[in-house]
């Protein structure tokens, strides 16, 4: 409530008090009342009424001005609100679009970063492979140019492990034919000298009967590369070797192979099993430097 309204209310209260004074029984008249009695009172009342009227007029005028201003303000505010709402709406739409664009850009950026990362990894792999192939190629070239007696790197499609190269067949041959194949490749059927090598070979051949470079065709068991059998590593299945004659193929069992669980068994040398070739890398050799 404005100050003017408060003042007006205050005057109304005073007037009602005044009426009550007139209706009541005549009280003792002090000095003030005597001064204010008769025509003076009328004049005073008229003066007050006039003052009150002026005040009311002033206030009314001010009020209508205020109302006008308020209306104007309301209108301005209404326009402002509408305009602001429109702007806010527009901004929120733009904001939504910007947000969507931001999200789209973010996901694009993320994708590009991912693609870039993948490309980088792929490129690194290719570079690594290229370096490896280049090294292998330069080594193969050196081997071709040399007399072939010393090997400084594994041939293509052979697996290097602990300074040896291994080749795993995917077809089957009789033991002697497999042995010949390895020799043609300047290698020999695999000679297993440790539990570690056993595990490596087993991992690559899986649960498949596979010939190794161990036989007793001339009497005692012998490794094809001359490694001593008696003092060396062995991994026979229980009760093996048994030189079994009950297979009906003639003769006993003179050739050793890895069985499905990796342990060794002796079998008829004519059976067409897979095989593993092995060749040692030249002890003194170093990898050729890349030019």
């Amino acid at each position: 409530m404005t100050k003017e309204y408060q003042d007006l209310q205050h005057l109304d209260n005073e007037e009602s008090d005044h009426h009550q004074l007139r209706k009541g029984p005549p009280p003792p008249q002090p000095l003030l009342q005597r001064l204010c009695s008769g025509p003076r009172l009328l004049l005073l009342s008229l003066g007050l009424s006039l003052l009150l009227l002026v005040v009311v007029c002033v206030i009314g005028s001010q009020n209508s001005q205020l109302q006008e201003e308020l209306r104007g303000l309301r209108e301005t505010f209404s326009n402002f609100t509408a305009s602001t709402e429109a702007q806010v709406k527009g901004l929120s739409t733009q904001g939504g679009n910007v947000g969507r664009k931001m999200k789209s850009l973010e996901s694009q950026l993320e994708k590009q970063q991912k693609d870039l990362s993948e490309d980088h990894s792929s490129l690194l792999l290719h570079v690594k492979q290229f370096v490896s192939d280049l090294r292998s190629l330069s080594c193969q070239m050196a081997a071709l140019q040399g007399n072939g007696s010393e090997r400084t790197c594994c041939p293509v499609n052979w697996v290097e492990h602990e300074r040896s190269c291994y080749w795993f067949s995917r077809s089957g041959k009789a033991w002697a034919d497999a042995d010949n194949y390895c020799r043609l490749e300047d290698a020999h059927l695999v000679v297993v000298t440790s539990w570690e090598e056993q595990k490596f070979v087993q991992h690559h051949i899986g649960p498949v009967n596979t010939w190794m470079g161990l036989h007793d065709q001339n009497g005692p068991w012998k490794w094809v590369d001359g490694t001593d059998y008696e003092t060396g590593f062995k991994n026979w299945r229980p009760e093996q070797p048994d030189d079994w004659y009950g297979h009906g193929l003639g003769g006993g069992e003179d050739c050793a192979h890895f069985t499905d669980d990796g342990r060794w068994n002796d079998d008829v040398c004519q059976r067409p099993y897979r095989w593993v070739c092995e060749t040692e890398l030249d002890k003194a050799s170093q990898e050729p430097p890349l030019l």
Epitope: G148, K173, A176, N180, Y181, R183, L184
Partner: antibody, heavy 122, light 107 residues
Framework: QVQLVQSGAEVKKPGASVRVSCKAS????????IHWVRQAPGQGLEWMGW????????NSAQRFQGRVTMTRDTSINTAYMELNRLRSDDTAVYYC???????????????WGQGTLVTVSS | DIQMTQSPSSLSASVGDRVAITCRAS??????LAWFQQKPGKAPKSLIY???SLQSGVPSKFSGSGSGTDFTLTISSLQPEDFATYYC?????????FGGGTKVEIK
């Protein structure tokens, strides 16, 4: 043109050794396998073994293992076959033959030497 | 070892005849088969490799066919210089083995 020229005829006593040579010309000696094949009088052909001239790697038929030694000298493009502990049934003409260049063609012969007669007689 | 069986072991034919010699392997050898011609006192001469491929310099009257276990050498028109002994040989497996030979004689 490709030629394989073998050493002359030999007469040996049982228990002795014989060494037959095979000189190659007209091609890259280290690029092809060399095989040794023998033929007893009036009989068929019998394969003895091979040598890989570039590496010196060899293999022989089981019946000759421990008795036959195959070597080569790349400086003079010559392959050698030595047979030990000769018996009378080793009397035969011994041939060298050029094999293929790869593991796939190792046993394919295209050119043969003229043969060397080895007679084992007491 | 793979056994190679040739048939016939000998045959008589006239000049101009078409002659066929067969060779059977004791197991599948694919197309790893060669044919040789040998004349008395001479070294064998290579005619056919890989069952049907002609060695360079060998006349086209010689042809080879077959795969697996059964193979044939055919001489389309026999000439006087073709009278000789013919051998087949497998190169599929160690040890390399030869057929017993087929002697082609003049009738």
């Amino acid at each position: 043109q490709v030629q394989l020229v073998q050493s002359g005829a030999e007469v040996k006593k049982p228990g002795a050794s014989v060494r037959v040579s095979c000189k190659a010309s007209g091609y890259t000696f280290t690029g092809y396998f060399i095989h040794w094949v023998r033929q007893a009088p009036g009989q068929g052909l019998e394969w003895m073994g091979w040598i890989k001239p570039n590496s010196g790697g060899t293999n022989s038929a089981q019946r000759f293992q421990g008795r036959v030694t195959m070597t080569r000298d790349t400086s003079i493009n010559t392959a050698y076959m030595e047979l030990n502990r000769l018996r009378s049934d080793d009397t035969a003409v011994y041939y060298c033959a050029r094999g293929g260049t790869t593991v796939a063609t190792w046993g394919v012969f295209d050119y043969w030497g003229q043969g060397t007669l080895v007679t084992v007689s007491s | 070892d793979i056994q190679m069986t040739q048939s016939p072991s000998s045959l008589s034919a006239s000049v101009g005849d078409r002659v066929a010699i067969t060779c059977r392997a004791s197991q599948d050898i694919g197309n790893c088969l060669a044919w040789f011609q040998q004349k008395p006192g001479k070294a064998p001469k290579s005619l056919i490799y890989s069952a049907s491929s002609l060695q360079s310099g060998v006349p086209s009257k010689f042809s080879g066919s077959g795969s697996g276990t059964d193979f044939t050498l055919t001489i389309s028109s026999l000439q006087p210089e073709d009278f000789a002994t013919y051998y087949c040989q497998q190169s599929d497996s160690y040890p390399l083995t030869f057929g017993g030979g087929t002697k082609v004689e003049i009738k």
